[in-house]
């Protein structure tokens, strides 16, 4: 939802968290603001305090329940409002009718581990975190490997077009230090975006055997 120079963007993690960012040019840094969430068909509502993340933007997380509880469904619509205190009263600064499963951003994959490593290849697995059972197998992943002397931005993206929580990296250089990251995205949702990248997993390929043709 955009009002003039105001921007209010929220994502649902598919389970029990809505994360929001509100930015407004010229807003006072010390103003007290909140996000209010009112689902259309549920008995609860939720509030979080917006905290500054930069000169003109604030963020907060609406915690709807325990991390793995399914607090919203595919048919819920949540009215989200930014409310800022002006003296003794609250003023509404932004509002949107939020369809949670059209605005998804899952948590970063976790538990990355090396399953098997050789001289030229490495098998890595991971787990998805706090993802709804709604998605069944309809998720996709992107992965990238950081090679020596390169940046993450230069790393080519590998796409896994199905729910596959492992990858076999090939054509690696022996006895070399690498880092690996992965992110996840459901197919569902018009405004759905990629999760954050996972924490990098560092690994080293095995050295080539001496005197062997590799």
């Amino acid at each position: 939802a955009v009002n003039g120079t105001s921007r209010f963007t929220c994502f649902y993690n598919s389970r029990a968290n809505i994360s929001c960012v509100w930015s407004q040019d010229g807003a006072l840094q010390d103003t007290s603001c909140q996000v209010h969430a009112w689902p259309d068909r549920r008995r609860w509502n939720q509030t979080c305090e917006l905290l500054p993340v930069s000169q003109a933007s604030w963020a907060c997380n609406l915690i709807l329940g325990t991390p793995d509880s399914q607090k919203l469904t595919a048919v819920d619509i949540v009215t989200l409002r930014v409310m800022c205190r002006e003296g003794v009263r609250w003023r509404m600064m932004a509002i949107q009718d939020f369809k949670p499963f059209e605005n998804l951003r899952l948590m970063a994959p976790i538990s990355l581990q090396v399953v098997h490593v050789e001289t030229h290849r490495c098998n890595i697995s991971w787990k998805i975190s706090q993802a709804s059972h709604y998605f069944e197998r309809h998720l996709e992943f992107e992965a990238r490997t950081l090679s020596p002397g390169h940046t993450w931005e230069e790393a080519p993206l590998m796409t896994l077009k199905q729910k596959q929580e492992w990858i076999c990296l090939e054509t690696l250089t022996p006895d070399t230090q690498y880092e690996f990251q992965v992110r996840v995205k459901p197919l569902q949702g018009e405004f759905t975006t990629w999760s954050p990248w996972s924490q990098p997993l560092a690994f080293r390929t095995k050295p080539a055997a001496l005197g062997k043709d590799t």
């Epitope: 509880s69 469904t73 595919a74 059209e102 059972h133 709604y134 998605f135 197919l187």
Partner: antibody
Framework: EVQLVQSGAEVKKPGATVKISCKVS????????IHWVQQAPGKGLEWMGW????????EYAPGFQDRVTITADTSTDTAYMELSSLRSEDTAVYYC??????????WGQGTTVTVSS | EIVMTQSPATLSVSPGERATLSCRAS??????LHWYQQKPGQAPRLLII???QSISGIPARFSGSRSGTEFTLTISSLQSEDFAVYFC?????????FGQGTKLEIK
């Protein structure tokens, strides 16, 4: 192999109630959604609603809300659909199906319900 | 509720030829459109999700596309087992609704 096996055909009188079962296998029933769809001769396919076996939550389509009850027994991996106050236009094939909320990945074989006086 | 209109109601095509089936939504549904195939006496079978994503195990000759509120299912080279009824279904606004179906018959 994913399977949904439904109970047999039913013949009911107007005003009666029918209860159809759907026994599932080949997947984890406790983190699945089981849906029910009606296919009536003149009306095509109509979504009736679903149950989330993880938490027991149900969602009913407005056109069926007053008359349908969907339940699940996680001890037997079986879902049930009960339709009350039957009328002749409820004569149809009823399907259970598994899927996320948005589409139906696997279907039962269907149960024919005939409502006739 | 959203009305899904499929055209034509019946389509006659020869085996080996291309078939193009259309589905139009009464309002914008983003890419929340799914396609099913149903043969006589059988339950429907899911073919395509989100307008164009094919389901694993479905032959590559089935493909989907979207232009605004109009969605198309294309079968590139018809096989004998493809003659059936095809339904579209939207999942943008509850209750999800189906089209009335297109019957694909042998010419």
């Amino acid at each position: 192999e994913v399977q949904l096996v439904q109970s047999g055909a039913e013949v009911k009188k107007p005003g009666a109630t029918v209860k159809i079962s759907c026994k599932v296998s080949g997947f984890n029933f406790k983190d699945s959604l089981i849906h029910w769809v009606q296919q009536a001769p003149g009306k095509g396919l109509e979504w009736m609603g679903w149950i989330d076996s993880e938490n027991g939550e149900t969602e009913y389509a407005p056109g069926f809300q007053d008359r349908v009850t969907i339940t699940a027994d996680t001890s037997t991996d079986t879902a049930y659909m009960e339709l009350s106050s039957l009328r002749s236009e409820d004569t149809a094939v009823y399907y259970c199906a598994r899927g996320g909320p948005w589409f139906l990945s696997y279907w039962g074989q269907g149960t024919t319900v005939t409502v006739s006086s | 509720e959203i009305v899904m209109t499929q055209s034509p109601a019946t389509l006659s095509v020869s085996p080996g030829e291309r078939a193009t089936l259309s589905c139009r939504a009464s309002q914008i549904i983003s890419n929340n459109l799914h396609w099913y195939q149903q043969k006589p006496g059988q339950a429907p079978r899911l073919l395509i999700i989100y307008g164009l994503q094919s389901i694993s195990g479905i032959p590559a000759r089935f493909s989907g596309s979207r232009s605004g509120t109009e969605f198309t299912l294309t079968i590139s080279s018809l096989q004998s087992e493809d003659f059936a009824v095809y339904f579209c279904q939207q999942s943008n606004n509850w209750p999800w609704t189906f089209g009335q179906g297109t019957k694909l018959e042998i010419k």
